[in-house]
Interface confidence: low
């Protein structure tokens, strides 16, 4: 039962994270939460950084600055892959949740 519950939580978290990405960066509250998660957990996007390509308000070769290894204003614009966290946040935060919750 624990595994089923954990899978359900992960699925919900994945859906919610992607939903929040859709509102980035127009909803300031959402943006700050996602930025905090990405910066704190050193991750980018839901599955990986390429998820940001699919977000209407984000353009080609752009990720939020919070995806950068060294966060500076504008670092996510025309980013270099070596300079950003490529791992997805759902898996990374999910792993942390599994260990700590």
């Amino acid at each position: 039962a624990g595994y089923v519950f954990r899978d359900k939580v992960m699925s919900e978290f994945n859906n919610n994270f992607r939903q929040q990405m859709e509102n980035y960066p127009k909803n300031n509250h959402t943006a700050s939460i996602l930025d905090r998660m990405q910066a704190d957990f050193k991750c980018c996007g839901a599955a990986n950084y390429t998820d940001w390509e699919k977000i209407p308000s984000m353009s080609k070769n752009r990720v939020p600055d919070s995806c950068c290894i060294n966060v500076t204003v504008g670092c996510g614009i025309n980013f270099n892959e070596k300079a950003i966290h490529k791992e997805g946040c759902v898996e990374k935060i999910g792993g942390w949740l599994r260990k700590n919750v």
């Epitope: 127009k26 300031n28 390509e53 699919k54 209407p56 308000s57 353009s59 080609k60 070769n61 752009r62 614009i77």
Partner: antibody, heavy 120, light 108 residues
């Protein structure tokens, strides 16, 4: 210099189809979102449709949803608007517009337009 | 959909005048508001984006302000080439992108 040149406008009967094209030059076409905006004679601007740089996101005005299809060919630096089941109220000058790099819904360059007249 | 309402619909002014056009959104759009100028027989031209950012090449007599639901476009000293129709546009909740109905600026 950025240039957008629309073509394909014509006089067509209601119910018929038409395909508009927009040839782009002077910028890296596949970095930018593109749009179609129309203006009926003597009226204001009405956004018709938009498409993201990689065709991953497309949007339509309710008035054309299900009848018009936007597409792009990045290799040919061209934007298209397939217009089916045309109505009299689709009569307008159709502009092709380029989105800003980091705010794709802001149109920083426009073509001169191509005229579509729907009449029997 | 978000409705954009401009006022006035038309106004007459003289060269050298300070002119203000307002745009109101039916709900908060943060600073996602853009202004365009259109002269008769010509394509629209972007003047201001993100409420107050002046587009490259646009004279500094044009300025924009506001956030939330109320926005203004100001021309500090009207020049002969400024007589045109001005449109506001929201880019907050899209699709659809929506424009105001336009404000026609005429010579007094």
């Amino acid at each position: 210099e950025v240039q957008l040149v629309e073509s394909g406008g014509a006089l067509v009967q209601p119910g018929r189809s038409l395909r508009l094209s927009c040839a782009a030059s002077g910028f890296t076409f596949d970095d930018y979102a593109m749009h179609w905006v129309r203006q009926a004679p003597g009226k204001g601007l009405e956004w018709v449709s938009g498409i993201s740089w990689n065709s991953g996101t497309m949007g339509y005005a309710d008035s054309v949803k299900g009848r018009f299809t936007i597409s792009r060919d990045n290799a040919k630096k061209s934007l298209y608007l397939q217009m089916n089941s045309l109505r009299a109220e689709d009569t307008a000058l159709y502009y092709c517009g380029k989105g800003l790099l980091h705010q794709w819904e802001v149109l920083d360059y426009w073509g001169q337009g191509t005229l579509v007249t729907v009449s029997s | 959909d978000i409705q954009m309402t401009q006022s006035p619909s038309s106004l007459s002014a003289s060269v050298g005048d300070r002119v203000t056009i307002t745009c109101r959104a039916s709900q908060s759009i943060s600073s996602y508001l853009n202004w365009y100028q259109q002269k008769p027989g010509k394509a629209p031209k972007l003047l201001i984006y993100a409420a107050s950012s002046l587009q490259s090449g646009v004279p500094s007599r044009f300025s924009g302000s506001g956030s939330g639901t109320d926005f203004t476009l100001t021309i500090s000293s009207l020049q002969p080439e400024d007589f045109a129709t001005y449109y506001c546009q929201q880019s907050y909740s899209t699709p659809p992108i929506t424009f105001g109905q336009g404000t026609r600026l005429e010579i007094k």
